[in-house]
Amino acid sequence: AVNGTSQFTCFYNSRANISCVWSQDGALQDTSCQVHAWPDRRRWNQTCELLPVSQASWACNLILGAPDSQKLTTVDIVTLRVLCREGVRWRVMAIQDFKPFENLRLMAPISLQVVHVETHRCNISWEISQASHYFERHLEFEARTLSPGHTWEEAPLLTLKQKQEWICLETLTPDTQYEFQVRVKPLQGEFTTWSPWSQPLAFRTKPAALGKDT
């Protein structure tokens, strides 16, 4: 049995994945729980097993199809339910009518690479992964650079207000190790949020030429 309040939050990656987290304040006995997705007009439904991520929250990924297939669109509404087994039957613990394109969180950008590096600047490119064709160019990015002696949280955010999959970092220190991350967000969707940060890309600026003033 369950007491207390629960929170059920899901995001669509814009292609073929809905990721959900269910949090439950009250005590939940050892039981099997799952998320069930039932689209309003599609000839499929999907479930995933909720697995614990902390003492009071569980997560799962609804895999709707091949990673780059467009399984849902702006016209869809998906009924999402948390179901937990109670004896021989399933009990509905949480339910929401989920509009995929109002609740977007894309996959983290991938394939980060240094295009060109100099003493004071570095040009970096990346790619977006599993992003819907519906966005066309309506995406924005945030980037951050980790400097020696600082934390990621201290790194200033650079905002790219358009679909630009590269950046030229300026005013870097010669012969210095840096790390770089980027994340992406569609402009569409009332509850849309930033993707996770990309894997960090490590790079080193070139040393200053000997005898040259830096």
Epitope: D40, S69, Q70, T73, T74, H133
Partner: antibody
Framework: QVQLVQSGAEVKKPGASVKVSCKAS????????IEWVRQAPGQGLEWMGE????????NHNEKFQGRVTFTADTSTSTVYMELSSLRSEDTAVYYC?????????WGQGTTVTVSS | DIQMTQSPSSLSASVGDRVTITCKAS??????VAWFQQKPGKAPKSLIY???YRYNGVPSRFSGSGSGTDFTLTISSLQPEDFATYYC?????????FGQGTKLEIK
């Protein structure tokens, strides 16, 4: 088995309104969108809009916005399409169809003739 | 609005022929395309959804393919009852739209 049965043919004068019914059976009525599609004589198919009976949610083709009204009566599993301010170019066969996968089951059609 | 352009607009063929009808969307619609068959004085009949999935009861000679903007309906071996008008349809975004139709006639 799934069936959509529509009301009979109508003859209307320009400026009048027409209300076409679509009675569903053989499935959970509240759960599936009902679409309305029309076909003028010798012409192709044109989507007018849709209603989800369980929630009353509605989406229109903007071309008909303000002239078309969709309603649903869950007690009788019937959907209604009312088109107002009729003109001669509204003469057409009007179909209801269920949306599951795409438009899978269709009503037999209702002929609406607008003539003075 | 997304335009669905079918070709050809009419086609003459014989029983046993293999026939292909194409449909081009003005924007990417993923695989949210359906195909319908309509005979004179009758309601459309659903054949294919999600570009390539046949509805129950639809003969296997009907097949659909494509994604993005280019789609095809193929009838592998025409039967006498297949002579009709065929429509493609996108339900990817509002307003839902149809192709102008392809009339398949007996040669």
């Amino acid at each position: 088995q799934v069936q959509l049965v529509q009301s009979g043919a109508e003859v209307k004068k320009p400026g009048a309104s027409v209300k076409v019914s679509c009675k569903a059976s053989g499935y959970t009525f509240s759960r599936y969108w009902i679409e309305w599609v029309r076909q003028a004589p010798g012409q192709g198919l044109e989507w007018m809009g849709e209603i989800l009976p369980g929630s009353g949610s509605i989406n229109h083709n903007e071309k008909f916005q303000g002239r078309v009204t969709f309603t649903a009566d869950t007690s009788t599993s019937t959907v209604y399409m009312e088109l107002s301010s009729l003109r001669s170019e509204d003469t057409a066969v009007y179909y209801c169809t269920r949306h599951y996968g795409s438009f899978d089951y269709w009503g037999q059609g209702t002929t609406v003739t607008v003539s003075s | 609005d997304i335009q669905m352009t079918q070709s050809p607009s009419s086609l003459s063929a014989s029983v046993g022929d293999r026939v292909t009808i194409t449909c081009k969307a003005s924007q990417n619609v993923g695989t949210d395309v359906a195909w319908f068959q309509q005979k004179p004085g009758k309601a459309p009949k659903s054949l294919i959804y999600s570009a390539s999935y046949r509805y129950n009861g639809v003969p296997s000679r009907f097949s659909g393919s494509g994604s993005g903007t280019d789609f095809t309906l193929t009838i592998s071996s025409l039967q006498p009852e297949d002579f009709a008008t065929y429509y493609c349809h996108q339900y990817s975004s509002y307003p839902f739209t149809f192709g102008q139709g392809t009339k398949l006639e007996i040669k």
